[in-house]
Amino acid sequence: ESLGWDIAELQLNHTGPQQDPRLYWQGGPALGRSFLRGPELDKGQLRIRRDGIYMVHIQVTLAICSSTSTSRHHHPTTLAVGICSPASRSISLLRLSFHQGCTIASQRLTPLARGDTLCTNLTGTLLPSRNTDETFFGVQWVRP
Amino acid sequence: ESLGWDIAELQLNHTGPQQDPRLYWQGGPALGRSFLRGPELDKGQLRIRRDGIYMVHIQVTLAICSSTSTSRHHHPTTLAVGICSPASRSISLLRLSFHQGCTIASQRLTPLARGDTLCTNLTGTLLPSRNTDETFFGVQWVRP
Amino acid sequence: ESLGWDIAELQLNHTGPQQDPRLYWQGGPALGRSFLRGPELDKGQLRIRRDGIYMVHIQVTLAICSSTSTSRHHHPTTLAVGICSPASRSISLLRLSFHQGCTIASQRLTPLARGDTLCTNLTGTLLPSRNTDETFFGVQWVRP
């Protein structure tokens, strides 16, 4: 562990109430193929415990979805991954809209610091699938 | 190699017969930019040779495709990556539907064990492009 | 650095003139969360300085975009990442079309050599967003 190979892969636990766009995550072998090795969960949000550059990746699939359901809503369904605390470091890292699709998937490299808490905000009225092969979120420490 | 840096990037060889949804892969410098360094191919399916957490990634582009061709089929075209053998470890790891798009691309972290064979199942009537920059599949060992 | 952990994450600087499909990138802490640690920029194009296998990833979001704007153009908007110099090694590594979506995102493993310059060509009449959470391009050295 001293090598700093912090890594986590999470599965969706639940969505927040209507005015809370955050997705709430869970991880651990008892739940399936999700795990936390270094990072930790704080009320369903992922907290970084080691400084470094991380590969952040996410896939979210909408639970009830057809190309019409994503396109006909007035407010487009959007997924944003960002640092939500500490407030001084709050920033959006990765953002995608579903448009006429039902799944978004992306990844990026970004510097993260110990104590950074990552939030994944899903805005819109559609809820995500909780199938573990359709919706997941992970980080991988790649270098100091 | 003793570091465990097992890694592979594969290109599409061919699809199976009608009742076999699997994609068959190939890799090696003679074929272009694909390679196998650790993992191996067993009848076109990728077999893991070292336990660990892997980053699995895939991109599949449909060969003759427009947004209408993906949306007008009754059975949506779907790509699933999973462990197909040994049977005791069979599970879907990553799943995406094309909906109104012609390409899917995603990645995830997952624990894999020596002997796990990964299958990539493409269901639907549309065939994938064999262009090496449009359809590819790879794994990268990232930690024990 | 001797470990060979070359890594870069870039943000969009600007597009080229009409007959130049290349995207021009920039990176550095002063610009936000982008950085270059090993690779370098040559007139907005990313140049590799260490041989190895790299994970290349990209996300591009179109600036003024709806599902109709991407579908109604005769020439589909396409993004291709490739080695553009030296000419002897010129090849397309990764290619995606937007179809009815407004964002593409993908990643792949590929061998790169010192001196390889990567170009990201966006063809079509639509322009990319310069928001740093919507459009980015990066590489990560993963093994020799």
Epitope: T15, P17, Q18, Q19, D20, A63, I64, T125, L126, L127 | - | -
Partner: antibody
Framework: QVQLVQSGSELKKPGASVKVSCKAS????????MNWVRQAPGQGLEWMGW????????TYADGFTGRFVFSLDTSASTAYLQISSLKAEDTAVYFC????????????WGQGTLVTVSS | DIQMTQSPSSLSASVGDRVTITCQAS??????LNWYQQKPGKAPKLLIY???RLHAGVPSRFSGSGSGTDYTFTISSLQPEDIATYFC?????????FGQGTKLEIK
């Protein structure tokens, strides 16, 4: 503890208006959306829509646009449902409801307000 | 809109009986299914959310199961205080929709 207390029963004539209140206590009012649910006599539950208590933005279900208005008095931690041009078929019990941790799962309900429309 | 069809509309059972109510959605609702109990003149009370999760304080004789479009609510051993009307509700997208209710009576 969380409580939603609604105003009392109302008897109205067709064409009149009514304003039902739902006073919240035991939590920060602007943290949770307020939903409205209708139940006609002997009938099932019908979701009418909700109001974002932070932004004030209402969302109405089909069939509840025009004559139905959701509003707020955040200083009083109160949500309101106003129905204008009342019709006999508006006779029902109206409930306000709130989520806790999960989207679209209603843990807390007001006691209901019976609105009777009769000439 | 997603239609929720609940059955039966009413049922009569004895104390100690196992009681089952079903709810069918007009499309896959991905386990976003909740069950409420309503007694006469009262507001509904949440019993089960996300198909099978028991709300805090709800007796363990209540349970839920199902997937896709078909869901089941079960009372393993009916008690006199369980006399009420039970509603299912889909919580996957707006507009939220409820089943028409099942009125449970004691024989």
């Amino acid at each position: 503890q969380v409580q939603l207390v609604q105003s009392g029963s109302e008897l109205k004539k067709p064409g009149a208006s009514v304003k039902v209140s739902c006073k919240a206590s035991g939590y920060t009012f602007t943290n949770y959306g307020m939903n409205w649910v209708r139940q006609a006599p002997g009938q099932g539950l019908e979701w009418m829509g909700w109001i974002n208590t932070y932004t004030g933005e209402p969302t109405y279900a089909d069939g509840f646009t025009g004559r139905f208005v959701f509003s707020l008095d955040t200083s009083a931690s109160t949500a309101y449902l106003q129905i204008s041009s009342l019709k006999a078929e508006d006779t029902a019990v109206y409930f306000c409801a709130r989520e806790e941790d999960y989207r679209y799962v209603f843990n807390y309900w007001g006691q209901g307000t019976l609105v009777t429309v009769s000439s | 809109d997603i239609q929720m069809t609940q059955s039966p509309s009413s049922l009569s059972a004895s104390v100690g009986d196992r009681v089952t109510i079903t709810c069918q959605a007009s499309q896959d609702i991905s386990n976003y299914l909740n069950w409420y109990q309503q007694k006469p003149g009262k507001a509904p009370k949440l019993l089960i959310y996300d198909t099978s999760r028991l709300h805090a304080g709800v007796p363990s004789r209540f349970s839920g199961s199902g997937s896709g479009t078909d869901y089941t609510f079960t009372i393993s051993s009916l008690q006199p205080e369980d006399i009420a009307t039970y509603f299912c509700q889909q919580g996957v997208t707006l507009p939220l929709t409820f089943g028409q209710g099942t009125k449970l009576e004691i024989k």
